[in-house]
Interface confidence: low
């Protein structure tokens, strides 16, 4: 399927002009590629009669120019001085030859209508209203005044002055004078439908003296606006029906053949195709609204309408906006999973894209709601805090420069499944929803924490060992403290081998974090969780509360309170080829200098690595040697 | 979670001016319209005005001309300048902020609500 778009349609009349919008796919060769409007022959072949090579043909020299706007992937193409010569089928397109990605466009060019020379003409657009004035001379001004509509033989009446009205015109059709002028009158249509369109004559008085006037009028469907999206991005549908229905309910419908299906309406009404991915947005009181849709799919793609009427339905006779969505395939937006499955007491690592090109953009994660027009509060976000009921359990990791962030999401419940959406402050085309499934756990978790009720004691050592399988033997292991601003990564001391191993014992698997000596500020939230470079996989979460030493139980003397949490990995590793543990030099011991960090569990390699942190809460700072990693207050 | 405290509510005779303040705290990255709703006793909460981030403003009828919001984004505030009051302005006046993605009409679209500051004009 070509990814070039345009109007399918185009109709105007002899001497006037047309301005035709082409739409390309944002890369730097379809940017400077030749541009070219050319007209199909019967032969299939198709003649250039303009490209943005400078070529113009004869017909069209004068009165055509043809303009690449790169900033926008658009390039226009203008024709003035149109005659019905013109009306035929032509192609927009890219590329050397006039075989590239290309558009085909039907032009139609009407000759002007023949109107009786004093008809006055009036353009109103479908479901607007009008009024016509009616002139007629003081003489007349006792006689009775009427509207009536030609038709093939005869005029068939509107509305009278004496209050006679046409069945189809009940309750839209009112004729009426203004203050004290007995010169004019005026007739009001209201709803206006394709079939109101034509010729009309009001009139004042009978016989020879009465005043005629001709009117004619042209009802027109509204031109719809092309929206060129790429596939799994987000489009905003802006709304603007006028204050005359800001009261009335409004909708957003895609055509379907003769009818229009709703998708969504202020009623309440969603198609189940866009559960998750839509909202209704009233905008104000003048009758405007907005409907937003993320993650586009091709199947989106069609002629969409918005309304208003009490019914929340499309309605004959009323105001309506048209759009023709293009959904290009040669998407600029990964294709990332759209569901996510977790399981109770689980975790979830969802992997949010955005623009590359706006690193520093905020990126946000908030949950759809369905309920009346749909929403989606914000729940967490950069430079912003986790909101309240999410405490502990949530945290987004943002990844600077590689176009994605992560929202990490643990101790999860079924109340969590549902549509989660990726935004930034910045491209609005780069919102993504993702549906969260929880199932209920059948097994243990992959991660376990012990003690699992976790109480330290004020000015002791406290450990917590994190418990993992030998599935994530070749991961990093982490562990971080959770505030509302984040979950920020403790520096860790790996005491285990990173090279494949001959066996793995599953239940000496486990990474330790101490905190030496205990203070008041290390209460809180803690979490376990592995990550393969920039990939965050599973986490747990742990609440270690903080007491006052009961009298009489033993004191640790913090020689120095630089000297504050550890995190050590202990792996089991069977490699009978090292069997001497490094000895290294401490700079600057630490309380745990005379002791070993570990027991020592199997055969020990590799340098010890630490693990960047990843930003500091609290205040906090934090630094590392080569042996001991400390988390200082 | 976003909180909003109003302030500056009263009592005023008719014709005089009041200036109502909303301070917001919390999450508020998340805001993006703010504005003004009011209850009179029986009857249901109505629009005041609403401003954007951008500064976009929209005003009920019934107080265009009489009343100006306006907004301080680096502060997180949003004030309600109220001249020429009239009587049937008595009411509990909300402050109220959408969302990220939420909009608004009569409210149904506000994530966040202030608990309300009464405002009472005597004839």
């Known amino acids: 399927k070509s990814p070039i778009f345009g109007p399918q349609e185009v109709s105007s009349i002899e001497g006037d002009s047309v301005s035709i919008t082409c739409y390309y796919p944002d890369t730097s060769v379809n940017r400077h590629t030749r541009k070219y409007w050319c007209r199909q022959g019967a032969s299939g072949m198709c003649t250039t009669l303009i490209s943005s090579n400078g070529y113009l043909s004869k017909e069209y020299s004068g009165r055509a120019n043809l303009i690449n706007f790169p900033e926008n992937n658009t390039f226009v193409i203008n024709i003035e001085q149109l005659t019905q010569d013109d009306t035929g089928s032509y192609k927009c397109g890219l590329g050397t030859s006039n075989r590239g990605l290309s558009f085909d466009v039907s032009l139609e060019v009407s000759q002007v209508p023949e109107l009786p020379s004093d008809t006055h003409v009036y353009t109103k657009d479908i479901g607007r209203n009008v009024t016509i004035e009616c002139p007629f001379k003081r003489e007349n001004a006792p006689s009775k005044k009427s509207l009536c509509k030609k038709t093939n033989q005869s005029c068939e009446l509107v509305i009278d002055s004496t209050e006679k009205v046409n069945p189809s015109y009940i309750g839209r059709a009112k004729l009426f004078m203004k203050g004290t002028d007995l010169t004019v009158f005026y007739v009001n249509i209201s709803h206006l439908t394709h079939n109101d369109a034509g010729l009309y004559i009001c009139q004042a008085g009978e016989g020879p003296s009465a005043d005629k006037k001709n009117v004619d009028l042209q009802v027109l469907a509204p031109e719809p606006e092309l929206l060129y999206k790429d596939l799994r991005s987000s489009v905003t549908f802006e709304c603007d029906l006028g204050r005359e229905v800001a009261n009335e309910a409004k909708y957003l419908c895609r055509m379907n053949k003769e009818t229009c299906d709703v998708i969504i309406n202020t009623l309440g009404k969603r198609d189940p195709d866009f559960e998750g991915r839509i909202l209704i947005t009233p905008k104000d009181d003048n009758g405007r609204f907005s409907v937003l849709i993320t993650g586009l799919r091709k199947e989106d793609a069609g002629h969409y309408q918005c309304g208003a009427h009490s019914s929340g339905l499309p309605q004959e006779g009323w105001p309506i906006q048209t759009w023709q969505l293009f959904v290009n395939e040669e998407s600029t937006i990964p294709n990332r999973r759209s569901v996510v499955k977790g399981v109770t007491g689980g975790s979830v690592a969802i992997a949010c894209p955005y623009n590359p090109k706006e690193s520093s953009s905020l990126k946000y994660w908030c949950r759809w709601e369905g309920d009346g027009n749909g929403h989606c509060p914000v729940l967490v976000g950069t430079q912003a805090q986790v909101q309240e009921e999410y405490e502990g359990r949530l945290a987004l990791f943002d990844q600077p420069g590689n176009g994605t962030y992560t929202v990490i999401l643990n101790q999860l419940t079924t109340e969590d499944a549902g549509f989660y959406w990726c935004l930034t402050n910045g491209d609005s085309r780069w919102r993504t929803t993702i549906e969260l499934q929880v199932a209920e756990a059948t097994r243990e978790p992959n991660l376990e924490v012990t003690p699992q009720n976790a109480t330290a004691v004020l000015g002791e050592t406290f450990t917590v060992s994190c418990h993992y399988p030998c599935k994530f033997y070749s991961q990093e292991k982490y562990w971080c403290k959770w505030s509302n601003k984040g979950c920020h990564i403790l520096p860790s001391h790996d005491e285990g081998a990173r090279q494949s191993s001959v066996s793995c014992d599953q239940s000496s698997q486990l990474v330790s974090m101490t905190l030496n000596p205990v203070s008041k500020e290390d209460e809180g939230w803690y979490w376990c969780g592995v990550k393969q470079g920039q990939t965050y996989g599973e986490t747990t979460a742990i609440y270690i509360a903080v007491e006052e030493r009961t009298r009489g139980s033993s004191h640790v003397n913090p020689t120095d309170a630089n000297a504050r949490a550890k995190v050590a990995l202990e792996e089991e590793v069977v490699d009978s080829s090292i069997s001497e543990k490094e000895n290294k030099a401490i700079p600057n011991p630490g309380p745990f200098a005379n002791e070993r960090e570990i027991q020592n569990v199997g055969d020990q390699a590799q340098e010890n690595r630490a693990s960047g942190d990843a930003g500091s809460a609290d205040g906090q700072s934090r630094s590392s040697s080569s042996k001991h990693h400390h988390h200082h207050h | 979670q976003v909180q909003l405290v109003e302030s500056g509510g009263g009592l005023v005779q008719a014709g005089g001016s009041l200036r109502l303040s909303c301070a917001a705290s919390?999450?508020?990255?998340?805001?993006?319209?703010m504005g003004w709703y009011r209850q009179a006793p029986g009857k249901q909460r109505e629009l005041v005005a609403v401003?954007?981030?951008?500064?976009?403003?929209n005003y009920a009828d019934s107080v265009k001309g009489r009343f100006t919001i306006s907004r301080d984004n680096a502060k997180n505030t949003v004030s309600l300048q109220m001249n020429s009051l009239k009587p049937e302005d008595t009411a509990v006046y909300y402050c109220?902020?959408?969302?990220?993605?939420?909009?608004?009409?009569?409210?149904?679209?506000?994530?966040?609500w202030g608990k309300g500051t009464l405002v009472t004009v005597s004839s």
């Open positions: 109220a902020a959408t969302g990220v993605l939420a909009g608004w009409a009569a409210g149904d679209g506000m994530d966040y």
């Open positions: 401003i954007t981030r951008g500064g976009s403003t």
């Open positions: 919390g999450s508020i990255f998340a805001i993006n319209g």
